[in-house]
């Protein structure tokens, strides 16, 4: 913490400008009043200060605002962001997609995940959901941060908006976030044809269920083996071996390559030999010829 | 040791159809897809399609699916390339090929000795 | 389809030059790319694989580099032996492709 000391007449402050790079820290502290740094907070980003002399700043907003800054100030904080933590962070209402930008455009390069994610949960919880505006602005100046939201705030967002949504911003999204994501992207999509509704949907399956993965193996999609490997293992394990040779069409050749990881080992274990040999891979591991395989879990569930 | 055996030259006349085999040895047949490739005079190589040995499901090159037919024979350990209305542009050599599984979809590790097919009237 | 773009299509070089070969895809093939070596009436002969793994035997003259959609192919020091057409071939996708071929001969 800075010491306090008493302002030098001669250091007195009374506008935000380039001489006050000049001062120790202990100046900074002593000289610089909190409101007229929050008033003039627009300046700030111009002037070249230290990453000691910001933490100065810092120190003063969070004495001048315990519970948190107000929006005028968040929308200019600039490089003054950087010395955020979540915890700061968590205490701010925003709804100005103009601070989420300048926000974003200022982490760019820095590691900054998790306050950058603490930004835009309150982003979404200070507009009230996850609209479209909010979602392109995301997307334009943050790939991948629509998966840093929780599968809460993402339940907020209405399925009209989906369609704003690109693959590449679902990269990181976890299997309950796509869980999420899944349901409201069929709805979106549900009036496309055949072709065109998977090359839309496919980003969104690593939430789909079972059924509908059946039902995309009638389809001739020819599910590429990436985007096979992220569905859900509890997805994947119901498939026949004609099933899922009829929704990887050409692509099941590459199932060997995937042999040892999951869900294709999961899924292997399942299948009868015999109809794992129909693919032609020389995949092994499947139940032996002559065995009978018992569901130990339905007489669980009886007793 | 794995070995990709072709049948020899053809010449055939245009509108014509072609038949080639590609008997494998040295190692489980039905572990691994084969592949047809060609190559025409003063032409880079082109893939064709590929076959599942152990059930004699095809898949082809778009450019080919209206005339080109792959099927397999697993008693012999032989798969067979079958191009139908045949044209000058037909003429080149034609290759099995057999994947090695390594990563992804497979690279070629094993080639046959090509089949030389000449399309003239 | 993924098509692979590869230049040049003919070159001539002195023995002991160093050689390159470009291959690009028209989209992003994950390093799943192998080159080949094709002398007349034989059948080709795989040099690389995974953009950079060489094949056991194969000289280490030879290499490869790249990512994403650009791939390059050189020999380090041209063999009169090594005069054939070389090719590359993307197996990101099961239905293969390859590239153009590039002729390489000496001057």
């Known amino acids: 913490d800075v010491e306090r000391t008493t302002c030098p007449p001669e250091k007195e402050v009374h506008e935000i400008d380039e001489s006050l790079i000049f001062y120790k820290k202990r100046e900074l502290e002593a000289c610089v009043d909190a409101a007229l740094l929050a008033a003039q907070m627009d300046r700030v980003d111009a002037i070249p200060f230290t990453y000691e002399q910001l933490d100065v700043l810092k120190h003063k907003l969070d004495e001048l605002y315990p519970q948190g800054y107000p929006e005028s100030v968040i929308r200019h904080l600039g490089h003054l962001f950087l010395k955020m933590s979540p915890e700061d962070i968590r205490k701010w209402n925003v709804t100005s997609l103009e601070t989420l930008k300048a926000l974003l455009k200022v982490s760019k390069g820095h590691e900054m995940s998790a306050q950058v994610a603490t930004l835009i949960d309150r982003v979404v919880v200070g507009r009230g959901q996850l609209d479209k505006d909010t979602v392109d602005t995301l997307t334009a100046f943050c790939p991948g941060c629509l998966c840093s939201l929780s599968p809460e705030r993402l339940s907020s967002v209405p399925p009209s908006v989906i369609g704003a949504v690109r693959p590449q911003d679902l990269d990181t999204c976890g299997p309950r976030q796509l869980d999420v994501l899944y349901p409201k992207a069929r709805l979106a999509f549900q009036n496309m044809s055949g072709s065109e509704y998977f090359v839309k949907i496919r980003p969104f399956l690593g939430g789909a269920p079972t059924e509908d993965v059946k039902a995309l193996s009638q389809q001739n999609v020819s599910m590429d083996l990436a985007t096979f490997m992220k569905l859900r293992r509890e997805a994947v394990l119901p498939l026949t071996v004609a099933e899922v040779q009829k929704l990887l069409g050409p692509h099941v050749e590459g199932l060997k390559v995937e042999e040892q990881h999951s869900p294709v080992r999961d899924w292997i274990l399942k299948q009868r030999q015999d109809d794992l040999d129909t693919l032609g891979l020389g995949l092994q591991g499947g139940i032996p010829n002559g065995y009978l395989i018992l569901d130990l879990s339905v007489r669980e569930a009886l007793s | 040791e794995v070995q990709l055996v072709q049948s020899g030259a053809e010449v055939k006349k245009p509108g014509a159809s072609v038949k080639v085999s590609c008997k494998a040895s040295?190692?489980?047949?039905?572990?691994?897809?084969m592949h047809w490739v060609r190559q025409a005079p003063g032409q880079g190589l082109e893939w064709m399609g590929n076959?599942?040995?152990?059930?004699?499901?095809?898949y082809y090159n778009e450019r080919f699916r209206s005339r080109v037919t792959m099927t397999v024979d697993k008693s012999t350990s032989t798969v067979y390339m079958e191009l139908s209305s045949l044209r000058s542009e037909d003429t080149a050599v034609y290759y099995c090929a057999r994947p090695y599984y390594g990563s992804s979809y497979g690279y070629f590790d094993y080639w046959g000795q090509g089949t030389t097919v000449t399309v003239s009237s | 389809d993924i098509q692979m773009t590869q230049s040049p299509s003919s070159l001539s070089a002195s023995v002991g030059d160093r050689v390159t070969i470009t291959c690009k895809a028209s989209q992003d093939i994950n390093k799943y790319i192998a080159w080949y070596q094709h002398k007349p009436g034989k059948a080709p002969k795989l040099l690389i694989h995974y953009t950079s793994e060489l094949q056991p035997g194969v000289p280490s003259r030879f290499s490869g580099s790249g990512s994403g959609r650009d791939y390059t192919f050189t020999i380090s020091s041209l063999q009169p032996e090594d005069i054939a057409t070389y090719y590359c071939l993307q197996y990101a996708n099961p239905l293969r492709t390859f590239g153009g071929g590039t002729k390489v001969e000496i001057k």
């Open positions: 040295g190692y489980t047949f039905t572990n691994y897809w």
């Open positions: 076959i599942n040995p152990s059930n004699g499901g095809p």
